[in-house]
Amino acid sequence: SGVFQLQLQEFINERGVLASGRPCEPGCRTFFRVCLKHFQAVVSPGPCTFGTVSTPVLGTNSFAVRDDSSGGGRNPLQLPFNFTWPGTFSLIIEAWHAPGDDLRPEALPPDALISKIAIQGSLAVGQNWLLDEQTSTLTRLRYSYRVICSDNYYGDNCSRLCKKRNDHFGHYVCQPDGNLSCLPGWTGEYCQQPICLSGCHEQNGYCSKPAECLCRPGWQGRLCNECIPHNGCRHGTCSTPWQCTCDEGWGGLFCDQDLNYCTHHSPCKNGATCSNSGQRSYTCTCRPGYTGVDCELELSECDSNPCRNGGSCKDQEDGYHCLCPPGYYGLHCEHSTLSCADSPCFNGGSCRERNQGANYACECPPNFTGSNCEKKVDRCTSNPCANGGQCLNRGPSRMCRCRPGFTGTYCELHVSDCARNPCAHGGTCHDLENGLMCTCPAGFSGRRCEVRTSIDACASSPCFNRATCYTDLSTDTFVCNCPYGFVGSRCEFPVGLPPSFPW
């Protein structure tokens, strides 16, 4: 779509005569008829295929034609066309004398024609005017012409429609050739796709306006390049969404089970050595002089009853000192000045002489000990109960009262709540300090995996076109991460399918 514009500049008819040579009375009141048509090697009469236009009376005999475009007038003359400009044309300009006010062809006598010019040639679309002058024996016409595109039409032949736009169907202006020039921040064939924040992850991020980065499900961060771990993941990370890969020393579905209590809590005191012995379980090996589950208790050196033969022990800064009873001597009162003749054995002990009567030894009945059978046996002095068990004297024997989670004569065995296989449907059992926990397979839940739930949403391979499937364990649904060029909840559709219509 465009306009052929013809600007009449000057018409000279000095003698004021018609084409027949007859003079006009009182002068030639001149108007013009213009015919624009397709290119003809020899311009001939016939339909004005590109259009016609007529002027009012512009002057008498000889006159200059005023440029009237600014005032909405008729110069230049406009010949609009609604087709692709072919680049060639034929133009006929006729000057007529108007004896009266009726300028219609049928109202004029045939001999009212003053002059007729016909030209043809090539004409490219452009802003520049082509100046021309046609002279006959009696008249001269000076004019210029050009072809320009109508508003919103572009290109060499005004065939490209383009309307600048700045809404959600496009953000662009039009180039001289009719191609779109996207406004800053927009891209795509129709400039309707925003350019996301620089670095925004191509698959995991998107945007609805320029310089934005919105994350798809399972991703986070300014550039949507950080996966979101499973909801409730405590001491773990992910490499794909909804994972929970445990940090070192942690276990369980949510990485909240402490497998390295020693490092994380340092429970052993006074320089004791800590050993992990299971989930939230540990053993402290005390340095000499300390006792207790966490080696938190300082031992008195007299607690081991080092003084024999009834000697009494006294703590000292650098150790201890034994006060021996009469008849005994030595660091631990271990040497006797007595013999069997002195009846040194108490509580029914039998005396046996040694070293030719210079010394003796007492053989003690059950429940008594000491070099003179003077001490009742305390079976707990050797701290025989492991894992913090409490030692209890029970007459001739002893027993260990174990802490929760331990059993055995000496509390040396770790109780496994998992031994009875409490987790149903193939659930994995984990011992806890005060009980157990079941990690259920896909499709089961509940404290003992006894409740049947939905199966792994990704198990049926719902994603197409080599898309990656992620199971959102919190909602039992899947998310397909599409490869480039595919869209849809299952990545089943290639991007940019050509439109089709219902007819």
């Epitope: 959600h168 169907f169 309707q192 998107y206 991007v495 439109p499 219902p502």
Partner: antibody, heavy 121, light 106 residues
Amino acid sequence: EVQLQESGPGLVKPSETLSLTCTVSGGSISSSSYYWGWIRQPPGKGLEWIGDIYYTGSTYYNPSLKSRVTISVDTSKNQFSLKLSSVTAADTAVYYCAREDVILRGGSDYWGQGTLVTVSS
Amino acid sequence: SYELTQPPSVSVSPGQTASITCSGDTLGDKYVSWYQQKPGQSPVLVIYEDSERPSGIPERFSGSNSGDTATLTISGTQPMDEADYYCQAWDSETGVFGSGTKVTVL
């Protein structure tokens, strides 16, 4: 061939919220070439554009209805939805969902068959 | 708000040309679509981008748009063309429909 199907209650009480869903079949709602719109037509009257949505969730609303309209999209179900709050009898109309094509400069080439929603107590 | 004005009705004899106008401020600078709607049916797109016809739409439907007026022309009108016709354009981010024109084939 692309098909659109509106669904939702045909009767809503005044001051309540009108809720409709449009299910798209035969094509993906996640295509970058389309917006998905809602248009309504009161009985015996002309068409009125309500608003539209892109698959990313970007929405555009008619200013005259903006305070009451919410349009959302669920790409996993290939659906988009309309909610119109505080309805009155003037909201009684046939509600259409349609596909607006970027390539067609916003022309709507596919329409649902329409669903009549009556607002009455 | 932006408005598009259409004549309420246009009558045409079979085989004649029907012209429906749609007026709006600088409408020529916007892309216009035209829809045909028959009673009890959904609208059908007959013209987009001022003058383009979707596949399946007969050649007798044509469109133009310049200045403040867009025109839908049905040449050689047939009885089956009797329907309501709506023009539509986009103003900023808002879709705007014309008031509609009822075409009656006499």
